[in-house]
Amino acid sequence: LWMHKVPASLMVSLGEDAHFQCPHNSSNNANVTWWRVLHGNYTWPPEFLGPGEDPNGTLIIQNVNKSHGGIYVCRVQEGNESYQQSCGTYLRVRQPPPRPFLDMGEGTKNR
């Protein structure tokens, strides 16, 4: 069992969904779990989040906000063998840019 490389970082806008892949070469029903190292608290033990969503072990986090920031790590286990762990993907949550003034309706501008 071995893991493919994962992206070092993922940037998602506030309120959007984050999709994390956990590519591995297991052909069997590998068990994928996801863990998070909290942003700004890297000495704390990784936090258990839960299983992957599909046979590929994708993690989907809906409606992300700033507190979702951190490093997301997947672990893959086949049977009772020791698990393999990804290097982790750093989630950065981006504030969407404000709408430019010119986007406003003419009525709003003239008020």
Epitope: N31, P45, F48, G50, P51, E53, Q62, H68, Y83
Partner: antibody, heavy 116, light 111 residues
Framework: EVQLLESGGGLVQPGGSLRLSCAAS????????MNWVRQAPGKGLEWVSG????????YYADSVKGRFTISRDNSKNTLYLQMNSLRAEDTAVYYC?????????WGQGTLVTVSS | QSALTQPASVSGSPGQSITISCTGT?????????VSWYQQHPGKAPKLMIY???KRPSGVSNRFSGSKSGNTASLTISGLQAEDEADYYC??????????FGGGTKLTVLG
């Protein structure tokens, strides 16, 4: 502070239905797989059902499979358990819980009584 | 999905040490070491005492310790105190988002 608040319990007749809710606050709810765990009077803890963070994966104990449905509304930070075809042996306190690792959170539970 | 096996009851005098065992199969425990121990007083929700086999959450007394060897996990309480009298449950991750609990052990503090 993390809070999980269950509601929806009560007295129901055998064969009846009930829907439990669990309102979560103080945690990044959408990140976590969530679970329902029950405890019959004077008995031990029993895992009932679990759901992945986005709701794409659902899991059930054999004792409730085909009768209970777990779901979540991530826009409302709420977990649900729809219980149909209830039996006397489903009588228990039902806890909403995020299990595993150091971030392990439980509600105070809601009592479901199935009796005629 | 059969329960993990725990002794129904254990007892000890104040100041003594006791150990509660929790036995399962290799599929119950896997290699993730996601084994937790809970303390439950009557009418209360379970309280996490040990996570990932041997780690103590902040705020839990260092009189509580956990270990795991093969398919058996153990909880040891040293320097027994009256307030330790409660029910204790082990719990293990069993893949997907499924979990299995032990049947529970009633701890009696004598005298």
């Amino acid at each position: 502070e993390v809070q999980l608040l269950e509601s929806g319990g009560g007295l129901v007749q055998p064969g009846g239905s009930l829907r439990l809710s669990c309102a979560a606050s103080g945690l990044t709810f959408t990140s976590y797989a969530m679970n329902w765990v029950r405890q019959a009077p004077g008995k031990g803890l029993e895992w009932v059902s679990g759901i992945s963070g986005s709701g794409g994966g659902t899991y059930y104990a054999d004792s409730v499979k085909g009768r209970f449905t777990i779901s979540r509304d991530n826009s409302k930070n709420t977990l649900y358990l729809q219980m149909n075809s209830l039996r006397a042996e489903d009588t228990a306190v039902y806890y909403c819980a995020k299990l595993g690792g150091w971030s392990d959170y439980w509600g105070q539970g809601t009592l479901v009584t199935v009796s005629s | 999905q059969s329960a993990l096996t725990q002794p129904a009851s254990v007892s000890g005098s104040p100041g003594q040490s006791i150990t509660i065992s929790c036995t399962g199969t290799s599929s119950d425990f896997g290699s993730y070491n996601l084994v937790s121990w809970y303390q439950q007083h009557p009418g209360k929700a379970p309280k996490l005492m040990i996570y990932e086999g041997s780690k103590r959450p902040s705020g839990v007394s260092n009189r509580f310790s956990g270990s795991k060897s093969g398919n058996t996990a153990s909880l040891t309480i040293s320097g027994l105190q009256a307030e330790d009298e409660a029910d204790y449950y082990c719990c293990s991750y069993a893949g997907g988002s499924t979990w299995v609990f032990g049947g529970g052990t009633k701890l009696t503090v004598l005298g």
